[in-house]
């Protein structure tokens, strides 16, 4: 079953998504795909990335982190109730059916309504966006410099509490990295 | 128009070889998954083989895999499969189907119309 | 492999009827599934992909739904040109699987 992640309406949406390349700058292609991940590749791709680069994208689906160093995440801008369902993360490791494929379920909950006006934190001061439009070829890429890692096989209950968006959000400020792979 | 157009099916001896051509127009093809899907005289559709854009990874059917090849040429927008070692149980309809875009969809929105391969003494 | 069991195998209906036509898989498969329309003479066509999505070009009375194990493609009102056989096929796990089909017949 999907590990399942939350966000509200209006909000950035993040999901969670590492590898770690073999080498420095030794990348995997991954895509991102709206729907469970099926036998070849992702489904309705969203976002791509190949050897080198974030090769296609689409508008509201991004990536913050360091994808060179397997940071795949994917952030979803402002969104809306008919972003709920599941998420691929298919990262497509050479060779023949060896791709790792994971599949996340988005719950979008409507807004809460609140009586006093409460601080958001600006996304796109914190994190520029990277790409925003359909395209393809390089692109300039935010990086969130070097960060400390945090093993899978040290914090095993991570990835469980990482399924409230905000709670992600925070833990991709303070720099916590999953290892996969 | 998206048009696929086999070729190469006849027939053939029990252990003979034989290679399917398909010809695909209208569409970037190197955008494409391609495959082979077969169909046995009165029997159900069976999938056969996949190959990715570029032809770097090939998928077969495992009880197909050690005799039938399947290869694209990118540059002649053209997808093949070359069979080895010939049973009676391959005797077919042999469709090219168009699989997945790069950028998702459908894994078989277009076919060919298909070509008849025999295995018979 | 997954097994799809498609039903009916045939069935009998008039322009204008609503038909549906039933797949189960033989384990649950996300939503993966696409269904295909062959008439007589004629090339395979694709209708419908992940479950719900209808293919460029595929008029807004066929529909897909389901989840699970269990999906239906439905076409709302019969047109002269939608007798034909039917398949669905899932592409969830390897190798990809079609089901028998179902002929669809004037009554």
């Known amino acids: 079953s999907e590990v399942e992640y939350r966000a509200e309406v209006g909000q950035n949406a993040y999901l969670p998504c590492f590898y770690t390349p073999a080498a420095p700058g030794n990348l995997v292609p991954v895509c991102w795909g709206k729907g469970a991940c099926p036998v070849f590749e992702c489904g309705n791709v969203v976002l791509r990335t190949d050897e080198r680069d974030v090769n296609y994208w689409t508008s509201r689906y991004w990536l913050n982190g360091d994808f060179r160093k397997g940071d795949v995440s994917l952030t979803i801008e402002n969104v809306t109730l008919a972003d709920s369902g599941i998420y691929c993360c298919r990262i497509q490791i050479p060779g023949i059916m060896n791709d790792e494929k994971f599949n996340l379920k988005l719950v979008i909950k409507p807004a809460k309504v609140t009586p006093a006006p409460t601080r958001q934190r600006d996304f796109t001061a914190a994190f520029p966006r990277m790409l925003t439009t359909r395209g393809h070829g390089p692109a300039e890429t935010q990086t969130l410099g070097s960060l400390p890692d945090i093993n899978l096989t040290q914090i095993s209950t991570l990835a469980n509490e990482l399924r409230d968006s905000r709670l992600a959000n925070d833990l991709r400020d303070s720099g916590a990295t999953i290892r996969i792979g | 128009e998206v048009q696929l157009v086999e070729s190469g099916g006849g027939l053939v001896k029990p252990g003979g070889s034989l290679r399917l051509s398909c010809a695909a127009s209208?569409?970037?093809?190197?955008?494409?998954?391609m495959a082979w899907v077969r169909q046995a005289p009165g029997k159900g559709l069976e999938w056969v083989a996949n190959?990715?854009?570029?032809?770097?990874?090939?998928y077969y059917l495992d009880s197909l895999k050690s005799r039938f090849t399947i290869s694209r040429d990118n540059a002649k927008n053209s997808l093949y499969l070359q069979m080895n070692s010939l049973r009676a149980e391959d005797t077919a309809v042999y469709y090219c189907?168009?699989?997945?875009?790069?950028?998702?969809?459908?894994?078989?929105?277009?076919w060919g119309q298909g070509t008849l391969v025999t295995v018979s003494s | 492999d997954i097994q799809m069991t498609q039903s009916p195998s045939s069935l009998s209906a008039s322009v204008g009827d609503r038909v549906t036509i039933t797949c189960h898989a033989s384990?649950?498969?996300?939503?993966?599934i696409g269904w295909l329309q062959q008439k007589p003479g004629k090339a395979f066509k694709g209708l419908i992909y992940?479950?719900?999505n209808l293919e460029d070009g595929v008029p807004s009375r066929f529909s897909g739904s389901g989840s699970g194990a269990d999906y239906t493609l439905t076409i709302s009102s019969l047109q002269p040109e939608d007798f034909a056989t039917y398949y669905c096929?899932?592409?969830?796990?390897?190798?990809?699987?079609f089901g028998q089909g179902t002929k669809l017949e004037i009554k």
């Open positions: 189907a168009r699989g997945l875009y790069y950028y998702g969809g459908n894994y078989f929105a277009y």
């Open positions: 209208g569409f970037t093809f190197s955008d494409y998954y």
């Open positions: 190959i990715n854009y570029d032809g770097s990874n090939t």
């Open positions: 384990q649950g498969i996300s939503s993966n």
């Open positions: 992940q479950g719900s």
């Open positions: 096929v899932q592409f969830a796990q390897f190798p990809p699987t």
